[in-house]
């Protein structure tokens, strides 16, 4: 709904009245809206809500909301949806992180190593070799080294000492019983406080091929986000009448994968600098989609003197 009410706290912007040439000071419109009519000598500016697919993050004096970034390419998920106040933000699915502008699985720490630092959507797991008194018998991207089973606390003895890869094996002393019943199990050595830990380089254990471009990729360096869809259209192959069944068929891996090229199968391939899509603010967003429309159209959009 158009909104005319001016708040005492709202900022102002300067506008040149085309009819009179007069420079007027108008109240800005709130975030999520834009100026549909500038103020005049006799009237307040009029604000309207951003249409679907557009947004303004701040109070502003602009005449058109910013286009949201393109949909997140498969298999990325929407960290933030496109809404009147926010641009769309994309992130890697769980168990993965952004690496070389694509999603890679978190490193699997091998047996004998444990997680030193958990992985996030932007950082890989960090592994460390299990310290004395601890072990890891499972390759995992989430598990820390576990302390050896304390055999003594179970009135048992260590039959086979643990290693970096195996737990202590506990059993009864032969003098108490004629047979031993080994039972693996949490630590007989105290964990040393000042032991050196060895970090495994993450790349060592990333599954091979995660950063390769063997999937018929025509791009050797992957873009930050790639949407291979028609410019200005929304991909939707629900209707064969629209003739777009093959458009955007291969979004995963964030790379171009052998599309049939033709005048109606153009691809948008854009590298986004960290500042470009955020109006001069540094973005914490892992990934944003490219903007809709012709690349030149958007160059001025995110730093508008009337928006700041």
């Amino acid at each position: 709904q158009p909104e005319q009410k001016a708040s005492n706290l709202i900022g102002t912007y300067r506008h040149v009245d085309r009819a009179t040439g007069q420079v007027l000071t108008c109240d800005k419109c709130p975030a999520g809206t834009y100026v549909s009519e500038h103020c005049t000598n006799t009237s307040l500016r009029v604000c309207s809500s951003c249409p679907v697919g557009t947004f303004t993050r701040h109070e502003n004096g602009i005449e058109k909301c910013h286009d949201c970034s393109q949909p997140c390419p498969w298999p990325m998920i929407e960290k933030l949806p496109c809404a009147a106040l926010t641009d769309r933000e994309c992130t890697c699915p769980p168990g993965m992180f952004q690496s070389n502008a694509t999603c890679a699985p978190h490193t699997v720490c091998p047996v004998g190593w444990g997680v030193r630092k958990k992985g996030t959507e932007t950082e890989d797991v960090r592994c460390k070799q299990c310290a004395r008194g601890t072990f890891s018998d499972v390759p995992s991207s989430v598990m820390k080294c576990k302390a050896y089973t304390d055999c003594l606390s179970q009135n048992l003895v260590v039959i086979k000492p643990g290693t970096k890869e195996t737990d202590n094996v506990c059993g009864t002393l032969p003098s108490f019983s004629s047979s031993t019943s080994p039972s693996p199990g949490t630590a007989i050595f105290p964990r040393p406080e000042h032991m050196e830990t060895h970090e495994v380089p993450s790349s060592t254990y990333v599954p091979k091929g995660m950063n390769s471009t063997e999937s018929n990729s025509s791009a050797s360096v992957r873009p930050k986000v790639l949407s291979s869809i028609q410019e200005g259209t929304v991909p939707d192959n629900t209707s064969s009448a629209r003739g777009k069944e093959d458009v955007n068929k291969t979004l995963p891996n964030l790379q171009v994968v052998n599309h049939q090229q033709g005048p109606h199968h153009r691809h948008i391939l854009k590298l986004l600098p960290s500042m470009e899509a955020t109006g001069g603010e540094k973005s914490s967003t892992p990934i944003k989609g490219p903007k809709r429309g012709h690349p030149r159209q958007n160059l001025h959009k995110h730093f508008d003197i009337n928006e700041h």
Partner: antibody, heavy 118, light 107 residues
Framework: EVQLLESGGGLVQPGGSLRLSCAAS????????MSWVRQAPGKGLEWVSV????????YYADSVKGRFTISRDNSKNTLYLQMNSLRAEDTAVYYC???????????WGPGTLVTVSS | DIQMTQSPSSVSASVGDRVTITCRAS??????LAWYQQKPGKAPKLLIY???SLQSGVPSRFSGSGSGTDFTLTISSLQPEDFATYYC?????????FGGGTKVEIK
């Protein structure tokens, strides 16, 4: 605990229609792509369709294109599959699944059986 | 479309055996491959994602390897509860496609 629960399956005549629903709980539904996968009796798994987190962008297997429509209501945490012009070969258990870890289907519903027969 | 060819289609094995199932993609899919286990009347269960990452809660006797076009699922020491059908699936491009399945039966 993540849960997906399909409903709406049943017996339908060839050429008929059916609408499947999948109620999601235990996770934030709206950021995720969601999918339908089916399995004909005694056969393997076949991917049917997937929908973008905020809807609008949809992809289909060739075998169902033009007949099935996937949709979602993020306010209700529900995924839908509208099936029209049903054929005998559409008879299957239909699973709702979430592409999560590594884009693999990390959560599945128990499935709902759709039987197309006269 | 990317075809996924799984082999063998069935394997007879005993408890304690090492079982290897292979999956070949008709074109490179990097590491966008998952393995599932399915038991009769149940929904599939994710075992391995991204070719070699073990899904949380899955026993460490399951492991995956490979990238590009050739992938392997290995069960290092078969347990009674592992008798089931196993499927590979590529998540690289639409349409997403599954292998034909490998039934692991009791010898």
């Amino acid at each position: 605990e993540v849960q997906l629960l399909e409903s709406g399956g049943g017996l339908v005549q060839p050429g008929g229609s059916l609408r499947l629903s999948c109620a999601a709980s235990g996770f934030t539904f709206s950021p995720y792509w969601m999918s339908w996968v089916r399995q004909a009796p005694g056969k393997g798994l076949e991917w049917v369709s997937v929908i973008y987190p905020s809807g609008g962008h949809t992809y289909y297997a060739d075998s169902v294109k033009g007949r099935f429509t996937i949709s979602r209501d993020n306010s209700k945490n529900t995924l839908y599959l509208q099936m029209n012009s049903l054929r005998a070969e559409d008879t299957a258990v239909y699973y709702c699944a979430r592409p999560g870890f590594g884009a693999a289907f990390d959560y599945w519903g128990p499935g709902t059986l759709v039987t197309v027969s006269s | 479309d990317i075809q996924m060819t799984q082999s063998p289609s069935s394997v007879s094995a005993s408890v304690g055996d090492r079982v290897t199932i292979t999956c070949r993609a008709s074109q490179g899919i990097s590491s966008w491959l998952a393995w599932y286990q399915q038991k009769p009347g149940k929904a599939p269960k994710l075992l391995i994602y991204a070719a070699s990452s073990l899904q949380s809660g899955v026993p460490s006797r399951f492991s995956g390897s490979g990238s590009g076009t050739d992938f392997t699922l290995t069960i290092s020491s078969l347990q009674p509860e592992d008798f089931a059908t196993y499927y590979c699936q590529q998540a690289n491009s639409f349409p997403l496609t599954f292998g034909g399945g490998t039934k692991v039966e009791i010898k």
